[in-house]
C-alpha cells in the first residue's frame, strides 16, 4: 500500500465529528450478501439465487464480530462433494469436484489506542487480512503428474 | 451496525500515532488474491489455480484506487458464456451458463475532514459498499415460469 497521511484530525479538533462515517451508500441487495432461504440440498435449482442454481451449490454461514468492520461476514459452505449434473440438476457427476473459493478480505478491528504513557486513549482501527470462503466452484480434479 | 464510540483519539493526543495501522498480518497467499498466469482460454485446466480449473473459468482484472482501502481489488471476468464439459474440460455444454457472482464489499475512501468553519482538517475515512465480481459460477439457466 502507498503511504497515506495520518487519517486523524488535527490536534484539538472536536472528536464529536466521527472520523469514520458509518452511513452506507444505498446499493441494491445482491445475492451473496445474505444467506438464501431456499432448501439446502445437493441439487441445482432452476430458480432462486446464484448459490442455489449453481451446480456446486452452497449455503452461507454468518460470522459476526461487533469489534470488526464489516461486523457481518458470510462464509460459503458447499452442499455437495461433487458437481451436480447439468442434465438433471439432482444427480452428482463425480468427474467434477465442488471446491471452496477462498479470499483474504481486508477487515478492520477496533483496538484500544494507547497514549504516551500507555494510558487508554479511545479506539484505533487495525487493518487485518481475514480469510473468507466466497463460493463453491465446480472444478475438474487436479491431475497428479 | 451497532454503534461504536468515536474512533478518534481524545483531544490533544499526538496524531503521529496513526489511527489506522497499515501493517498486515502475514497470511499465506491465496489463489484469488492475484490474477493467474495460465493462458486465458475457455477451457478447464487440470492443474493451476481454482479459476483456471473451474468449468466456468475466469480471469482477474485489477481495480486500483489509491484513495481507497483496499487499494487493490480484483474483478472476475468469465472466459466462457457456457460451462465447460466435465468430460473433456475443453468443449462447452450449453445446458449450463457461466455467471458472475457479485458481492457488495465494504471499502473505505479517504476524504478530506472539515473543521468547525469548514476548513480542511486532515483526512477522514468514509465507509462505502463497493460492488465486486468474485468469481464465475456454473449454473442451470433460470426457468421462466
Amino acid at each position: 500500500y502507498s503511504h497515506w497521511p495520518s487519517c486523524c484530525p488535527s490536534k484539538g479538533q472536536d472528536t464529536s465529528e466521527e472520523l469514520l462515517r458509518w452511513s452506507t451508500v444505498p446499493v441494491p441487495p445482491l445475492e451473496p450478501a445474505r444467506p438464501n432461504r431456499h432448501p439446502e440440498s445437493c441439487r441445482a435449482s432452476e430458480d432462486g439465487p446464484l448459490n442455489s442454481r449453481a451446480i456446486s451449490p452452497w449455503r452461507y454461514e454468518l460470522d459476526r464480530d461487533l469489534n470488526r468492520l464489516p461486523q457481518d461476514l458470510y462464509h460459503a459452505r458447499c452442499l455437495c462433494p461433487h458437481c451436480v449434473s447439468l442434465q438433471t440438476g439432482s444427480h452428482m457427476d463425480p468427474r467434477g469436484n465442488s471446491e471452496l473459493l477462498y479470499h483474504n478480505q481486508t477487515v478492520f478491528y477496533r483496538r484500544p489506542c494507547h497514549g504516551e504513557k500507555g494510558t487508554h486513549k479511545g479506539y484505533c482501527l487495525e487493518r487485518r487480512l481475514y480469510r473468507v470462503s466466497l463460493a463453491c466452484v465446480c472444478v475438474r480434479p487436479r491431475v497428479m503428474g | 451496525y451497532s454503534h461504536w464510540p468515536s474512533c478518534c483519539p481524545s483531544k490533544g493526543q499526538d496524531t503521529s500515532e496513526e489511527l489506522l495501522r497499515w501493517s498486515t498480518v502475514p497470511v499465506p497467499p491465496l489463489e484469488p488474491a492475484r490474477p493467474n498466469r495460465h493462458p486465458e482460454s475457455c477451457r478447464a485446466s487440470e492443474d493451476g489455480p481454482l479459476n483456471s480449473r473451474a468449468i466456468s473459468p475466469w480471469r482477474y482484472e485489477l481495480d486500483r484506487d489509491l484513495n481507497r482501502l483496499p487499494q487493490d481489488l480484483y474483478h472476475a471476468r468469465c472466459l466462457c458464456p457456457h460451462c465447460v464439459s466435465l468430460q473433456t474440460g475443453s468443449h462447452m455444454d450449453p445446458r449450463g451458463n457461466s455467471e458472475l457472482l457479485y458481492h457488495n464489499q465494504t471499502v473505505f475512501y479517504r476524504r478530506p475532514c472539515h473543521g468547525e468553519k469548514g476548513t480542511h482538517k486532515g483526512y477522514c475515512l468514509e465507509r462505502r459498499l463497493y460492488r465486486v465480481s468474485l468469481a464465475c459460477v456454473c449454473v442451470r439457466p433460470r426457468v421462466m415460469g
Epitope: 449434473s85 442434465q87 438433471t88 439432482s90 444427480h91 452428482m92 457427476d93 463425480p94 468427474r95 | 475457455c42 477451457r43 464439459s85 466435465l86 468430460q87 473433456t88 474440460g89 475443453s90 468443449h91 462447452m92 455444454d93 450449453p94 445446458r95
Partner: antibody
C-alpha cells in the same frame, strides 16, 4: 460416406518433429471432434488428443508437452505435430472422428477411422 | 487416468461357440444422471483400423451382426460373440470415453480352436 486419410513421412529422425495430416472427404470437418490415436507395432492403442474445427484442442497429458494439433477448415484437414521424437514414438498413427451425442453434449466413441500410416523413428 | 484391463489376453473358441471377453475400468464409468456407461468395443483385423462394434456399453453400431452384444455396468463389462464365425478372428479392444484422457484396454486376441 465419410472417409479419412492420413499422410506424411514414414520415416523421421530421432529428436526431430513428426508431422502428419488427416484429410476428410465425404463430409465437412465442421461440427465434429477429430482425434489422433497411435498403435506401436504389436501393441495397444493410445489416444493422443482431439481438435475441434474451431481450433479448440485437448491433449493426452502424457504427450501434452510435445504435441500440437491444427485444423484448416478450408482444406477440410487437420494436422499433428509431435516434436523431439524417439524410437518409442514408432507406431501406426490413425486419425478418427468422434461421434458427438447432442443429447448429452458429450463426445462418444470413434465412429470413423483412417487406414493409418506407419511412422518409424530412426536413430 | 482411468486404466482399462482386459481378460483373457487371448482365447480360442470353436466355430459356432460362444466367446466372452471381459473389460474392467479402474473407476466407475457409469453416469447416474443419464444412466449411461461410457464404454465402447472395437474390433481390429490385421492391417486394418479398429471398427466400432458397441457403444454406451450395450448399443450395437448399425451394420454390426447381432451375434455381438455388450453388457455390464459401472466398472465391469463384457463383450459376447454368441456364435463365433471365421470372420470374427481379430483383436478386440474396450475403451472408456467417460473422461479425458480417453483410454483403451490392451486388447484380447480371438482365434478359432
Amino acid at each position: 460416406q465419410v472417409q479419412l486419410q492420413e499422410s506424411g513421412p514414414g520415416l523421421v529422425k530421432s529428436s526431430e518433429t513428426l508431422s502428419l495430416t488427416c484429410t476428410v472427404s465425404g463430409g465437412s470437418i465442421s461440427s465434429y471432434y477429430w482425434s489422433w490415436i497411435r498403435q506401436p507395432p504389436g501393441k495397444g492403442l493410445e489416444w493422443i488428443g482431439f481438435i475441434y474445427y474451431s481450433g479448440s484442442t485437448n491433449y493426452n497429458p502424457s504427450l501434452k508437452s510435445r504435441v500440437t494439433f491444427s485444423v484448416d477448415t478450408s482444406k477440410n484437414h487437420f494436422s499433428l505435430k509431435l516434436n523431439s521424437v524417439t524410437a518409442t514414438d514408432t507406431a501406426v498413427y490413425y486419425c478418427a472422428r468422434h461421434y458427438f451425442d447432442s443429447g448429452t453434449y458429450e463426445l462418444g466413441p470413434f465412429d470413423y477411422w483412417g487406414q493409418g500410416t506407419l511412422v518409424t523413428v530412426s536413430s | 487416468d482411468i486404466v482399462m484391463t482386459q481378460s483373457p489376453d487371448s482365447l480360442a473358441v470353436s466355430l459356432g461357440e460362444r466367446a466372452t471377453i471381459n473389460c474392467k475400468s479402474s473407476q466407475n464409468i457409469l453416469l447416474t444422471s443419464s444412466n449411461k456407461n461410457y464404454l465402447t468395443w472395437y474390433q481390429q483385423k490385421p492391417g486394418q483400423p479398429p471398427k466400432l462394434l458397441i457403444y454406451w456399453a450395450s448399443i450395437r453400431e448399425s451394420g454390426v451382426p447381432d451375434r455381438f452384444s455388450g453388457s455390464g455396468s459401472g466398472t465391469d463389462f463384457t463383450l459376447t460373440i454368441s456364435s463365433l464365425q471365421a470372420e470374427d478372428v481379430a483383436l478386440y479392444f474396450c475403451q472408456q470415453y467417460y473422461i479425458t484422457p480417453f483410454t483403451f484396454g490392451p486388447g484380447t486376441k480371438v482365434d478359432i480352436k
